[in-house]
Interface confidence: low
């Protein structure tokens, strides 16, 4: 971009650094100092006043940092005047055309649309801008600018090309790339290449989205790696690259793209729940309360667009009401209000529960914690303060089986006068017909029954949802409706509790924090053991992890807390997955005693599932009509499989497979195929054969013939037959060709020579070879053959051995014609 000098270099003092840029300078300064003096970065007392101005309309000003060219000299600055830069190097205009510091990518594909890049509806048009500010601080050179504007939702940032002759004269390079996208979007970067030398530094900072908001360091070179993804939760990101001399590394290439920011997941109100349609702008969060609680505040919140999207109001709360009348009651709950607050320390709450005519009420005491001296709970069978008392906390123990009204109403009165201990009350009511038992209830569990009407004789069996256990544990986990005259259950309902620790050996399940979904209490040390079948691993999915500061969940990769630590999880955490290396996983949750922090510490929900080990080669089926043996029980690297076939079957493929380092098999698994051919019967000596089929399949023939002078002994034709078991077989043995002529007599040994093998008779077709002693040469045929006939004859006379006439050694042993 050919800009004028005045557009880049401001008048001295004309720019005042913003709070954000001051903070950036401090942050960069601190981060670079941490690298230590061996990198050539030293603390300095002054800040370089040089400010590189971004293009018109932009306000980002990033001060450069103190630098020293050699230890102990203090910071050197470059004086700036309105007319240019003093120094012995090239003048500024020669440096204004930058090397390609940033490049725009190809147009984004429809598969991954970026944010809108033009005005939409009534929105003001904005652009995505990269401001790259470079300050080069030496005694002899001018600042190098590597800036480029980008108006795309994604692109690349690359280190400057420093191969030019001008660049090689530079002493120190200092670039700040500022990526700016729409409000409501954040910036995600992926490191594609990163090859920096030790002296180079690359910092990634989440820029202040608005003036006065300080940038935050996301990563430095030592924390970055190729393939790594970082997200800035603001619409501004800064990349700060420094090199004290001409870079020796291969530089960097970083891909960036805008992503739509979202509202945080709204907190679940105590004693209630929240459901969210979408966390992005426009999405809604709807709140509702548990039975016995009323919603205080807005039922629905909307996620509003903005630099940081946020909900349009405060999270509502669920408050218990102090008294009231419940008409036509069927099923519900009454709970004590929180002490203090609107109701004050003293409470007098009166509830009237009225069921329909012909029905009675069962009141189940779910949670009761009353201060003996200051709290009192009374329940009356009837609808008035004068009805007969059936429970008085000052006189009676908490009824395990609950209370049953004689009439269709219950009157509940709670009195509390400045209790020393927190008040807790949760009563569950349910209306039922008079001639049957009330419907049993099990929070976090299932009730199965032999009679859904719960008439006398009905059995109700209890079981808990995954992650919960029956309390009291063990049998009986069933109760019976007894006594037709006055039906009632013969035992109390159990409770399902998220326990502190336990042994889990299901293929899949849940680990819950103690007392989930209630907050866990302080002073916990729980250990869970998760065990799946051997040869498997455990995939653990952290669904919810929201524990108090100081509390910790430790995952051990094995059986017991002495195993290797897989992860230590604290504080609120996003969803994540973890994988054990073997079939055992131990979880330990520690929450030290002490007063709980109000409003914090929901707990945790962890799902687990057994999965195949992925450090083994894939399972291979055993061959049909054969078997295989393995060198190891599990198919780990180096395992050798040896394949064999049953009789009558042949192996197609390699008989040995090895599990390789990349967890693939060295070859495809072989197969055992029924053998449908006879073995090659072979040729015969002194004869030849003709076959009806070269592969010798069942039904094919082989015919044998002998050479002249030989006669066939055996079957001339063989047929290949199949058999029920084993391999196919030939109908006969292979015949032989027998000589039908008399032999040749040994012609004798030449004088001064010898034969290879001395025999009296040689059969037709046999050959005889002659040699001469040293100093003699062979005259005639070296080899003669017995030709069949009547009589059989040698092909020629035996040779002679004569004294050698020459010194040629090649003629001493053998001769030719």
């Amino acid at each position: 971009l050919p800009l004028k000098e005045e557009e880049i270099l401001p008048e001295p003092g004309s720019e005042t650094p913003t709070v954000a840029s001051e903070a950036l300078a401090e942050l960069l300064h601190g981060a670079l100092l941490r690298r230590g003096p061996e990198m050539g970065y030293l603390p300095g007392s002054d800040r370089d006043p040089t400010l590189a101005t971004p293009p018109a309309g932009q306000t980002l000003a990033v001060p450069s940092l103190p630098r020293a060219t050699e230890p102990g000299t203090g910071p050197l600055t470059t004086a700036v005047t309105p007319n240019g830069v003093r120094g012995a190097g090239p003048t500024a205009p020669e440096l204004l055309t930058p090397p390609p510091g940033t490049t725009a990518p190809p147009p984004p594909s429809p598969a991954s649309p970026g944010p809108p890049l033009g005005p939409e509806g009534g929105e003001e048009e904005t652009t995505t801008t990269i401001i790259t500010t470079t300050t080069v601080t030496t005694t002899v050179t001018s600042p190098v600018l590597c800036n480029n504007n980008i108006s795309e939702g994604e692109g690349y940032v690359e280190s400057p090309d420093l191969g030019s002759p001008v660049s090689r004269t530079l002493g120190l390079l200092d670039c700040t790339y500022s990526i700016h996208v729409y409000p409501g979007y954040g910036i995600e970067i992926q490191v594609q290449t990163l090859n920096l030398s030790q002296e180079e530094e690359l910092l990634v900072l989440a820029g202040g989205g608005s003036p006065g908001l300080a940038p935050r360091l996301l990563a430095n070179s030592s924390m970055l790696g190729e393939g790594q993804v970082l997200r800035s939760p603001t619409n501004r990101l800064l990349l700060h690259f420094q090199s004290p001399r001409v870079p020796r590394g291969g530089g960097f290439r970083i891909h960036y793209q805008a992503y739509l920011l979202s509202c945080g997941f709204p907190p679940r109100p105590a004693h209630g729940d929240v459901s969210v349609t979408d966390l992005h702008p426009g999405g809604t969060a709807t709140f509702h309360c548990d039975s016995g609680y009323q919603l205080q505040g807005e039922e629905t919140l909307i996620c509003l667009n903005g630099t940081r999207p946020s909900w349009n109001g405060e999270t509502p709360s669920c408050m218990a009401s102090c008294g009231g009348t419940i008409h036509n009651a069927t099923l519900g709950r009454i709970v004590s209000p929180e002490p203090g607050g609107a109701v004050g320390p003293n409470l007098t709450c009166r509830w009237v529960i009225e069921a329909a005519e012909g029905r009675r009420l069962h009141l189940h005491f779910e949670r009761v914690s009353l201060d003996e001296d200051n709290d009192r709970l009374m329940v009356r069978s009837g609808g008035s303060p004068l009805s007969p008392v059936i429970y008085d906390s000052d006189m009676d123990d908490v009824p395990e089986r609950g209370l049953i009204s004689d009439a269709q109403s219950l009157y509940v009165e709670l009195l509390s006068e400045t209790p020393a201990n927190p008040l807790l009350l949760s009563l569950r009511f349910e209306a039922f017909e008079e001639d049957r038992c009330f419907a049993p209830f099990l929070a976090h569990g299932n009730v199965t029954t032999t009679d859904p009407e719960y008439r006398p004789g009905a059995l109700a069996t209890f079981s808990c949802l995954p992650g919960y256990a029956l309390e009291p544990p063990g049998p009986p986990n069933a109760i019976e409706c007894v006594d037709p005259t006055e039906p009632h259950w013969n035992d109390t309902e159990p409770a399902c509790k998220a326990m502190c620790g336990g042994e889990l050996s299901e293929p899949a399940g849940v680990v819950l924090s103690p007392d989930w979904p209630q907050s866990y209490s302080p002073g916990q040390d729980c250990v869970w053991g998760v065990h799946v079948q051997e040869e498997k691993r455990i995939l653990l999915q952290v669904e919810i992890l929201n524990v108090r500061e100081g509390d910790m969940l430790t995952l051990f990769d094995g059986d017991g807390p002495s195993a290797r630590v897989l992860a230590q999880l604290r504080g609120p955490q996003p969803r994540r997955r973890l994988l054990s290396s073997g079939p055992d996983l131990t979880l330990q949750f520690q929450a030290p005693p002490g007063p709980p922090n109000p409003g914090l510490g929901q707990g945790f929900v962890l799902h687990f599932k057994e999965v195949p080990r992925n450090d083994t080669c894939p399972e291979l089926p055993p061959p049909e009509w054969g078997w295989r043996t393995a060198s190891h029980g599990d198919l780990i690297r180096g395992t050798v499989l040896t394949y064999q076939c049953e009789p009558g079957y042949e192996l197609l493929g390699s008989d040995i497979l090895t599990c390789q380092w990349d967890l693939s098999w060295s070859a495809a698994p072989p197969a055992c195929q029924k053998i449908m051919t006879c073995a090659d019967p072979g040729e015969i000596a002194n004869g030849h054969r003709t076959a009806s089929d070269a592969g010798f399949p069942v039904g094919s023939h082989v015919q044998y013939r002998c050479l002249p002078g030989y006669s066939l002994e055996g079957a001339a034709m063989l047929t290949c037959y199949s058999r029920d078991t084993g391999t196919p077989k030939w109908s006969d043995r292979v015949p032989k060709c027998a000589l039908k002529y008399e032999p040749c007599l040994n012609p004798g040994v030449p004088e001064n020579g010898y034969q290879t093998l001395y025999k009296h008779h040689y059969q037709a077709g046999e050959s005889l070879r002659f040699f001469c002693y040293e100093g003699f040469e062979l005259i005639g045929e070296v080899t003669i053959t017995c030709v069949p006939g009547h009589p059989s004859q040698w092909t020629s006379q035996p040779p002679l051995c004569k004294v050698t006439q020459t010194t040629d050694p090649s003629r001493q042993l053998e001769g030719g014609n």
Epitope: Q533, H607, P612
Partner: antibody
Framework: QVQLVQSGAEVKKPGASVKVSCKAS????????MHWVRQAPGQGLEWMGW????????NYAQKFQGRVTMTRDTSIDTAYLDLSRLRSDDTAVYYC????????????WGRGTLVTVSS | EIVLTQSPATLSLSPGERATLSCRAS??????LAWYQQKPGQAPRLLIY???NRATGIPARFSGSGSGTDFTLTISSLEPEDFAVFYC??????????FGGGTKVEIK
């Protein structure tokens, strides 16, 4: 090759039960969860639950709790879906689907069994 | 439970055109999303898992992207055999595992 072969179509009356089978071949049956997914005529897919063929452990969608039973016979590499108290809206194609082994998605599906519930 | 909403319900395109199918989750499911193709009278077939990984034997013209709540299945150039109904499925939270309502890709 890996395949799941399901039993043939069934016609049932409301209130009755149906048992669908799914025979696995070409892989180790006990090493992977088996899921059941149904699809009403002209509708989308609905997950019913899974069975661990190794242990017989199950996990059912809340909607089918109390009406569905998933079992298996490892001697013949077969999984079964039993749905009781049939209603007309249970008319659907019932698919068995092999778990991927790493996460809860399905890499092999049976061809489906049409169950028609009609009075 | 997590609700998946697919759009559009029907997509009318010609062979050779590019198809872009959307799936939106009611809450953040990271990248735990699978895509399936179902032809009339056939069982579904796995195309994509973990939002962007192609299943074995699936042609390169099928690609998946997205994370969090918004996901996209792209068919770069439609072949005649690609016309079918496509379903997304979240494999993040269970039970239950849930599917989208489906997008029908038909020949224009």
């Amino acid at each position: 090759q890996v395949q799941l072969v399901q039993s043939g179509a069934e016609v049932k009356k409301p209130g009755a039960s149906v048992k669908v089978s799914c025979k696995a071949s070409g892989y180790t049956f006990t090493a992977y969860y088996m899921h059941w997914v149904r699809q009403a005529p002209g509708q989308g897919l609905e997950w019913m639950g899974w069975i661990n063929p190794n242990s017989g452990g199950t996990n059912y969608a809340q909607k089918f709790q109390g009406r569905v039973t998933m079992t298996r016979d490892t001697s013949i590499d077969t999984a079964y879906l039993d749905l009781s108290r049939l209603r007309s809206d249970d008319t659907a194609v019932y698919y068995c689907a092999k778990d991927s082994g790493y996460d809860w998605y399905f890499d092999i599906w049976g061809r489906g069994t049409l169950v028609t519930v009609s009075s | 439970e997590i609700v998946l909403t697919q759009s559009p319900a029907t997509l009318s395109l010609s062979p050779g055109e590019r198809a872009t199918l959307s799936c939106r989750a009611s809450q953040n499911i990271s990248s735990y999303l699978a895509w399936y193709q179902q032809k009339p009278g056939q069982a579904p077939r796995l195309l994509i898992y973990d939002a962007s990984n192609r299943a074995t034997g699936i042609p390169a013209r099928f690609s998946g992207s997205g994370s969090g709540t918004d996901f996209t299945l792209t068919i770069s150039s439609l072949e005649p055999e690609d016309f079918a109904v496509f379903y997304c499925q979240q494999h993040s939270n269970w039970p239950p595992l849930t599917f989208g309502g489906g997008t029908k890709v038909e020949i224009k």
